[in-house]
């Protein structure tokens, strides 16, 4: 089996995590994707995930999370935004392809959250703009409901440095509705 | 087939201004991070800047904030770099590149010398 | 900002035989990771992404792998075009960085 590796990723509330997930574009390009989270024991859990067929360059916003898919690179960013200390958590991206199983990219995410506001952006962020424009549309989130059990496992050993993920759900406003962000040219 | 073809390059004296533009063709420009990426004679690959499709997000190396304008204009497609207060260590062939992280394509390059 | 060294910093093979060059992170850049070939008075090329997918159209004899600091590229059996320089670059955060480059030349 292949071995399952985590990337711990440190931040405070209010920052951004900014995710670039990798895909082969020639076999993935259009697939749906997904952003998810595991916890101990559990399916994984579908948060946000891109149309289908996902869409170039087409930013999905669910609540705090942002997907953004490039067909032309190869890559899937996730962000979630203003992050508080309950999204503390192991998340995963995927593709989705059934019949079969869902297709893990990357390492798995272990995000640490932890209080101490930042007035500036995330740890990975210099941005001297920063602007996300939203417009008041939204739809219906449309994520398959489908996820093998083979990709549930037990949570590999949290190291003594992560901060466990609370028990109570993450706390990601309208998480069924998916507003479209265009690209403004 | 994807062409970036830049422009603007030049002798510029320290202190003086350039601007670069980069003729986008063969892609959809408007769906596409651009960046400007630079090296310096017989030296290594240096990033400058990044701007997403829309202008939204905007990123630079820290030796040319302040100093240096990325922008984009999506129904010309074209890429230009704004560089003022030009130094000597600025000195390099600029290269326009498709992509904000990695860099798919690439164009040849335009050289800037700043110089006395 | 992460710093990423490359070593050897010239690699001296004969056409046909198996080239390895090393790229090392400061901190974990998970597979946010490329590598680049530059040929003398030519614009750099993108090989590798995400570690160890190959960019579209890139022969099988070059290949990639490794994730967080330690990543390997590796040519199986070099060819006369694939003399140039090598770069790898991390992608995980801002400020983007690149390494000081590999030069693979001919013994």
């Known amino acids: 089996a292949t071995k399952l590796t985590e990337e711990k990723y440190e931040l405070k509330e209010g920052q951004t995590l900014d995710v670039k997930c990798d895909y082969t574009l020639e076999k993935f390009a259009s697939s749906q994707k997904a952003w998810q989270i595991i916890r101990d024991g559990e399916m994984p859990k579908t948060l946000a995930c891109t149309e289908r067929p996902s869409k170039n360059s087409h930013p999905v916003q669910v609540g705090r999370i942002i997907l953004e898919d490039y067909h032309d690179h190869g890559l899937l960013r996730v962000r979630m935004v203003n992050l508080q200390v309950e999204d503390s958590g192991l998340y995963q991206c995927v593709i989705y392809q059934p019949p079969k199983e869902p297709h893990m990219l990357f390492d798995r995410i272990r995000l640490v959250v932890t209080k101490g506001f930042s007035g500036t952006p995330g740890s990975n962020e210099n941005s001297t703009q920063n602007v996300y424009k939203i417009p008041p549309t939204t739809t219906k989130a449309l994520c398959p409901l489908y996820t093998s059990p083979r990709t549930v496992t037990q949570a590999p050993p949290k190291s003594t440095a992560d901060v466990s993920t609370p028990d109570s759900e993450i706390n990601l406003t309208n998480v069924t509705d998916i507003i479209r962000v265009p690209v403004f040219n | 087939e994807v062409q970036l073809v830049e422009s603007g390059g030049g002798l510029v004296q320290p202190g003086g201004s350039l601007r670069l533009s980069c003729a986008a063709s063969?892609?959809?420009?408007?769906?596409?991070?651009m960046s400007w990426v630079r090296q310096a004679p017989g030296k290594g690959l240096d990033w400058v800047a990044s701007?997403?499709?829309?202008?939204?997000?905007?990123y630079y190396v820290d030796s040319v904030k302040g100093r240096f304008t990325i922008s984009r204009d999506n129904a010309k497609n074209s890429l230009h770099l704004q560089m003022n207060s030009l130094r000597a260590e600025d000195t390099a062939v600029y290269y326009c590149?498709?992509?904000?992280?990695?860099?798919?394509?690439w164009g040849q390059g335009t050289l800037v010398t700043v110089s006395s | 900002e992460i710093v990423m060294t490359q070593s050897p910093a010239t690699l001296s093979v004969s056409p046909g035989e198996r080239a390895t060059l090393s790229c090392r992170a400061s901190?974990?850049?998970?597979?946010?990771l490329a590598w680049y070939q530059q040929k003398s008075g030519q614009a750099p090329r993108l090989l590798i992404y995400?570690?160890?997918i190959r960019a579209t159209g890139i022969p099988a004899r070059f290949s990639g792998s490794g994730s967080g600091t330690e990543f390997t590229f590796t040519i199986s059996s070099l060819q006369s075009e694939d003399f140039a320089v090598y770069y790898c670059?991390?992608?995980?955060?801002?400020?983007?960085?690149f390494g000081g480059g590999t030069k693979v030349e001919i013994k």
């Open positions: 590149v498709r992509g904000g992280w990695r860099f798919e394509s």
């Open positions: 901190q974990s850049v998970s597979s946010n």
């Open positions: 063969g892609f959809t420009f408007s769906s596409n991070w």
């Open positions: 670059q991390q992608y995980k955060n801002w400020p983007l960085t």
């Open positions: 701007i997403k499709q829309d202008g939204s997000e905007i």
């Open positions: 995400g570690a160890s």
